[in-house]
Interface confidence: medium
């Protein structure tokens, strides 16, 4: 066969779909690899061809578009399953070609089983809600294009295994689920089941997402440095180990990059010659406020090191702060020794 631009297996698009549900999968060529869309390609005389490799097989085979009830079909740049079966799992390839041009990409499709409580190995998207922030909504995701706007589907929402009915602060409103005032107790997995008719059949779309209640921007503050502080002095003798923790509290802020770093005499530790190590640990509160600790360590401190300036810095979207550690050299205690002076010798 003649040369074809092969984009390989696009593992970034690990597509997971539920067994026994419709799935519409767009050829990734037009979304991520080529600079033109399907309509342009089609009007230029290019043909889109689909084939697949079954799970644990090496053999590429054509997709059977002659199954009963048109279970698998292609429409423009979309491959349709109405519905999927477990053994549809495999690597799918879409190839765009004519006599002079060829481009193809493969992607993995995993058909996933779920139980009647919607538990499954599906990777779930996370939706963050601000705690006690007023009405917030989540929307049933990835249901566009499955049915025309003239079709009015039935949408049922579940929290975990339970249908959302008469919940205190959670109200189903069609494709949306409204949280009147989000609380920690609202953390969990939420599922919308969209049921719609098509050609005398009924189909279900199941979409589960994880809701995580996080700190509100109303309560967000700039980083707070708990350590070092003015109450602790790091007094060391040369040769001892110097350990200074920098502990910083960050309020949760959506998409904020929290940073902590040390400077020694105004320079980053990597830029100076002393043998210094820094270990970082991170912990989170229930509302995803973050506490970062960076411990600066010098194994055998010199008197020169004890004269340096050690400053802990922190930055978030709310601002930047810095705090110097109080480091000093221990003053040796006076030694009381008995000295033998002249005139006291034995005669």
């Amino acid at each position: 066969s003649e040369r074809c631009d092969d984009w390989g297996l696009d593992t970034m698009r690990q597509i997971q779909v539920f067994e026994d549900e419709p799935a519409r999968i767009k050829c990734p060529l037009f979304e991520h690899f080529l600079k033109f869309n399907y309509s342009t390609a089609h009007s230029a005389g290019l043909t889109l061809i689909w084939y697949w490799t079954r799970q644990d097989r090496d053999l590429e085979e054509p997709i059977n578009f002659r199954l009963p009830e048109n279970r698998i079909s292609k429409e423009k740049d979309v491959l349709w399953f109405r519905p999927t079966l477990l053994n549809d799992t495999g690597n799918y390839t879409c190839m765009l070609r004519n006599t002079t041009y060829c481009s193809k990409v493969a992607f993995p499709l995993e058909v996933v089983q779920k139980d009647s409580c919607f538990n499954s190995p599906m990777k779930l998207p996370v939706h963050k809600l601000y705690i006690e922030y007023g009405i917030q909504r989540i929307t049933c995701p990835n249901v566009d294009g499955y049915f025309p706007s003239s079709v009015k589907p039935t949408i049922t929402w579940y929290m975990g295994c339970y249908k959302i009915q008469n919940f205190n602060n959670v109200i189903p409103e069609g494709m949306n689920l409204s949280f009147l005032i989000a609380l920690i107790s609202n953390n969990g997995n939420y599922t919308c089941v969209v049921t719609y008719p098509e050609n005398g059949r009924t189909f279900h779309l199941t979409r589960t997402l994880t809701v995580k209640v996080v700190g509100s921007p109303k309560n967000a503050v700039p980083p707070v440095i708990h350590s070092p502080n003015d109450h602790v002095v790091y007094e060391k003798e040369p040769g001892e180990e110097l350990l200074i923790p920098c502990t910083v509290y960050f309020s949760f802020l959506m998409d904020s990059r929290n940073e902590v770093w040390w400077t020694i005499d105004g320079k980053k530790p990597d830029d100076i010659t002393i043998d210094v190590t820094i270990n970082e640990s991170i912990s989170h509160s229930r509302t995803e406020d973050e506490t970062r600790t960076q411990i600066l360590s010098i194994k055998k401190v010199t008197s020169e090191d004890l004269k340096r300036s050690y400053v802990c810095h922190a930055r978030s979207a709310k601002g930047e702060v810095a705090k110097a550690a109080k480091v000093k050299q221990k003053v040796p205690a006076p030694r009381y020794t008995v000295e033998l002076a002249c005139g006291f010798g034995a005669t």
Partner: antibody, heavy 118, light 110 residues
Framework: SVEESGGRLVTPGTPLTLTCTVS????????MSWVRQAPGKGLEWIGS?????STYYATWARGRFTISKSSTTVDLKMTSLTTEDTATYFC????????????????WGPGTLVTVSS | AFEMTQTPSSVSEPVGGTVTIKCQAS??????LSWYQQKPGQRPKLLIY???TLASGVPSRFKGSGSGTEFTLTISGVESADAATYYC????????????FGGGTEVVVK
């Protein structure tokens, strides 16, 4: 054909497994369901295993009943049985096709009687 | 939870009469409704599926109708062989289901 077996007299709390044996049916193409009927009462769906292997249960059956299948059998595992579970247990085949059709039961077994009594 | 309500629970009709049994779903089930006939000591038998399609070998005096939430089974020119209990059953969803079957209607033929 479809035939149930394993029904017997058990004491409360005893686990019990019922087996539905099929012949001439490719279980990879059909959903199979368990339905029970207490004496003098109506039909009650317990759960189903669909062609691909996923299982679905009635809300009351979750956790206490487990359905599994091999190439020619469909098992119903029951735990913590009480006198309320006394019933004839039927195995039924769903119609071929997808979604709702698999919960249309076109072929039923004769049933097997489970009696739970102390 | 999803419920199927069947009425009446019992009906008595002379031979040649017409029996009407109603089934109501608590939410739309489109046309995913089946009707079964069960005689004492026997297994259930599928009569009608997809609300109105007669199963193989079922006499034409049995007629199913309805869609959405309201469904009807009509037996015209009832015969003594029709004495049985009839059940409706939804097949639209397996989620959050207590029981997809209606409570049953006993038909007595006089």
């Amino acid at each position: 054909s479809v035939e149930e077996s394993g029904g017997r007299l058990v004491t409360p709390g005893t686990p019990l497994t019922l087996t539905c044996t099929v012949s001439g049916i490719d279980l990879s193409n059909y959903a199979m369901s368990w339905v029970r009927q207490a004496p003098g009462k109506g039909l009650e769906w317990i759960g189903s295993v669909i062609s691909g292997g996923s299982t679905y249960y009635a809300t009351w059956a979750r956790g206490r009943f487990t359905i599994s299948k091999s190439s020619t059998t469909v098992d119903l595992k029951m735990t913590s049985l009480t006198t309320e579970d006394t019933a004839t247990y039927f195995c039924a085949r769903g119609c071929p096709g997808y979604n709702g059709d698999k919960y249309t039961f076109d072929l039923w077994g004769p049933g097997t009687l489970v009696t739970v009594s102390s | 939870a999803f419920e199927m309500t069947q009425t009446p629970s019992s009906v008595s009709e002379p031979v040649g009469g017409t029996v009407t049994i109603k089934c109501q779903a608590s939410q739309s089930i489109y046309n995913y409704l089946s009707w079964y006939q069960q005689k004492p000591g026997q297994r259930p038998k599928l009569l009608i599926y997809r609300a109105s399609t007669l199963a193989s070998g079922v006499p034409s005096r049995f007629k199913g109708s309805g869609s959405g939430t309201e469904f009807t089974l009509t037996i015209s020119g009832v015969e003594s062989a029709d004495a049985a209990t009839y059940y409706c059953q939804q097949g639209a969803t397996s989620y959050d289901i207590e029981n997809p079957f209606g409570g049953g209607t006993e038909v007595v033929v006089k």
